[in-house]
């Protein structure tokens, strides 16, 4: 058994039929020593008396939030939460797995830049009695720090018969140097708890490994006389570091119809312009990636041929 | 420690292709690794990350674009002497910063071709021959020192008695390619910044 | 199986035309772009132009430009390449090639070898 | 137009080691560049699309690199059907130009 936060209790169970269970020693936070009783949640059953109870937590009908009492007065509470280790592996039943880049990938994260600042997220099909907690740093021996703020619920999805809700958090590492080389990780540790459930999980990763920039703005056609050939140009996004030879970016630009399987024109770029064919019905677009250092594509920016 | 402004005139900053070159080579040559060796600890996650310049050159701190050395976090106090003079410097408005940072990744260059060439004798007396360093990446090493051109003393290779433990050798070189890739990114922000400058 | 099959080899006369066809089978004709690619002997690839044969788009070469013309006839499924004031150097096999992409080639026909001789 | 030098245009190679065959552009091209095999009387077949993307049915022998203005074509080891002509096409504007070609034969 550990503490999570302030009478807050995790107790950590090996769960099989017939398990054991932990037994858990719980102390009334009071100078009183005569007098006490226990009580679980809401119910007014009296589960023993003294300063100190002893209860074998098994499932999770023995866990919840224990108070102490004395002559109708609360002293004090205790929340029991159970981790659940089925097979000598932790439960991830809150999550669910994004299975990218790869299977058991719970948490994703990405940055819009070098700055330090990045965002990860989360799903789960759960809607109720749900919270979260994050923390992070770089490194996990030494910790250097990395601020989070609260994860919040950013977007909901229908996905066949059942609802998806996204959560998210920004992060923001405390001294970064856009320039750096890292060494050392970031770590990002979620805590989740729906109703007595706990469980956590873990991210490790660079922030050069999750680079994905804005796509590019700006995006202008001009026609070539006597061509059909278009020249497009665009910008780098407002929130890519600086300065821009240093922190280059590369681009593919592309013509396409509405459908991917059709024909299309297709060229990449280190240059913030491109000519290429436009076709009636189709779109240009462009996206950017780092130049020296592929990470991920950022999404298209789009403008019609017409 | 930072970059000037005034650098070389666009286009005649002879670094820019070999770095481009040399940032190539060492990808190709970690892809190759990491398949090659597909049973050994050769991924990015999976390494210890090591930087063998570590106190021995500066060279993110003393190439720090102008525009970051009012970033706090980016000024190292670390302190590293150089020796000032060099081909890449095409231009008399060249300051002594520049050469600095250009001296810094020719210490580089050279702590990597040695640390590679000793690897090198090693792997090429493993009897499963299961790989071996690109002569290619070897080759735009050498051609990017020579076109920096800083003289500095040899730096002897390291030879060793004892008999060389492949598996230990294999995933030493997994962790020198991927730190040599990454300081290979910083050279080449370096040189495309000096080039538009 | 997509296939491009060309027709066969041609003799012109210098000063004349010539007009070769490549029929395509398997995929739907429209959604390719078209191109035609030359080989003099013991020379490499020349570019010669392209069309898009669902609206009739086409791009030549500069070297080509005025002297050939590309076309498609979607109810055949068959391109056509015309070379016009055909000269000795103009010798070569002529291919045409396909890709959904507009820049390179997946898919070869066999080649037709057109000879320019007096 | 952009110029594509090929070398070496002639490389005899022992059946089993390695080839390696470079292709320059005269201007930098990004990663539009294109391999194609070419055998005797045969029509062209791609080998790899823009630098290093392998194409389907191609054997994973063949490896592209490069961008900017060098770029590489390596056959880890040389099969006896891969002797043949290997041209380069750039794809980064019209018109689009091919290499010399280099010639792959046995040693």
């Known amino acids: 058994i550990w503490e999570l936060k302030k009478d807050v209790y995790v107790v950590e169970l090996d769960w099989y039929p017939d398990a054991p269970g932990e037994m858990v020693v719980l102390t009334c936070d009071t100078p009183e020593e005569d007098g006490i009783t226990w009580t679980l949640d809401q119910s007014s059953e009296v589960l023993g008396s003294g300063k100190t109870l002893t209860i074998q937590v098994k499932e999770f009908g023995d866990a919840g939030q224990y108070t102490c009492h004395k002559g109708g007065e609360v002293l004090s509470h205790s929340l029991l939460l159970l981790h659940k280790k089925e097979d000598g592996i932790w439960s991830t039943d809150i999550l669910k797995d994004q299975k990218e880049p790869k299977n058991k990938t719970f948490l994703r994260c990405e940055a819009k830049n070098y700055s330090g600042r990045f965002t990860c997220w989360w799903l789960t099909t759960i809607s109720t009695d749900l919270t979260f907690s994050v923390k992070s740093s770089r490194g996990s021996s030494d910790p250097q720090g990395v601020t989070c703020g609260a994860a919040t619920l950013s977007a909901e999805r229908v996905r066949g018969d059942n609802k998806e809700y996204e959560y998210s958090v920004e992060c923001q590492e405390d001294s970064a140097c856009p320039a750096a080389e890292e060494s050392l990780p970031i770590e990002v540790m979620v805590d989740a708890v729906h109703k007595l459930k706990y469980e956590n999980y873990t991210s490790s990763f660079f922030i050069r490994d999750i680079i994905k920039p804005d796509p590019p703005k700006n995006l202008q056609l001009k026609p070539l006389k006597n061509s059909r050939q278009v020249e497009v140009s665009w910008e780098y996004p407002d929130t890519w570091s600086t300065p821009h030879s240093y922190f280059s970016l590369t681009f593919c630009v592309q013509v396409q119809g509405k459908s991917k399987r059709e024909k299309k024109d297709r060229v990449f770029t280190d240059k913030t312009s491109a000519t290429v064919i436009c076709r009636k019905n189709a779109s240009i677009s462009v996206r950017a990636q780092d130049r020296y250092y592929s990470s991920s594509w950022s999404e298209w920016a789009s403008v019609p041929c017409s | 420690r930072n970059l000037p402004v005034a650098t070389p005139d666009p286009g005649m900053f002879p670094c820019l292709h070999h770095s481009q070159n040399l940032l190539r080579a060492v990808s190709n040559m970690l892809q190759k690794a990491r398949q090659t060796l597909e049973f050994y600890p050769c991924t990015s996650e999976e390494i210890d990350h090591e930087d063998i310049t570590k106190d021995k050159t500066s060279t993110v701190e003393a190439c720090l674009p102008l525009e970051l050395t009012k970033n706090e976090s980016c000024l190292n106090s670390r302190e590293t002497s150089f020796i000032t003079n060099g081909s890449c410097l095409a231009s008399r408005k060249t300051s002594f910063m520049m050469a600095l940072c250009l001296s810094s990744i020719y210490e580089d260059l050279k702590m990597y071709q040695v640390e590679f060439k000793t690897m090198n004798a090693k792997l090429l007396m493993d009897p499963k021959r299961q790989i071996f360093l690109d002569q290619n990446m070897l080759a735009v090493i050498d051609e990017l020192m020579q076109a920096l051109n800083f003289n500095s003393e040899t730096v002897p290779q390291k030879s060793s008695l004892e008999e060389p433990d492949f598996y230990k050798t294999k995933i030493k070189l997994c962790i020198l390619l991927h730190a040599f890739r990454i300081r290979a990114v910083t050279i080449d922000r370096v040189m495309s910044y000096l080039n538009a400058s | 199986q997509v296939q491009l099959v060309q027709s066969g080899a041609e003799v012109k006369k210098p000063g004349s035309s010539v007009k070769v066809s490549c029929k395509a089978s398997?995929?739907?004709?429209?959604?390719?772009?078209l191109h035609w690619v030359r080989q003099a002997p013991g020379q490499g690839q020349e570019w010669m132009g392209w069309i898009d044969p669902e609206n009739g788009d086409t791009e030549y070469a500069p070297k080509f430009q005025g002297r050939v013309t590309i076309t498609a006839d979607e109810s055949t499924s068959t391109a056509y390449m015309e070379l016009s004031s055909l000269r000795s150097e103009d010798t070569a096999v002529y291919y045409c090639?396909?890709?959904?992409?507009?820049?390179?080639?997946?898919?070869w026909g066999q080649g037709t070898l057109v000879t320019v001789s007096s | 137009d952009i110029v594509m030098t090929q070398s070496p245009l002639s490389l005899p190679v022992t059946p089993g080691e390695p080839a390696s065959i470079s292709c320059r552009a005269s201007q930098s091209i990004s990663i539009n560049l294109h391999w194609y095999q070419q055998k005797p009387g045969q029509a062209p077949r791609q080998l790899i699309a823009?630098?290093?993307q392998s194409i389907s049915g191609v054997p994973s022998r063949f490896s592209g690199s490069g961008s900017g203005t060098d770029f590489t074509l390596t056959i880890s080891s040389l099969q006896p059907e891969d002797f043949a002509t290997y041209y380069c096409?750039?794809?980064?504007?019209?018109?689009?130009?091919f290499g010399q070609g280099t010639k792959v034969e046995i040693k």
């Open positions: 096409q750039q794809s980064n504007s019209f018109p689009l130009t």
């Open positions: 823009f630098a290093s």
């Open positions: 398997g995929g739907t004709f429209s959604d390719y772009y």
């Open positions: 090639a396909r890709n959904k992409e507009l820049r390179y080639f997946d898919v």
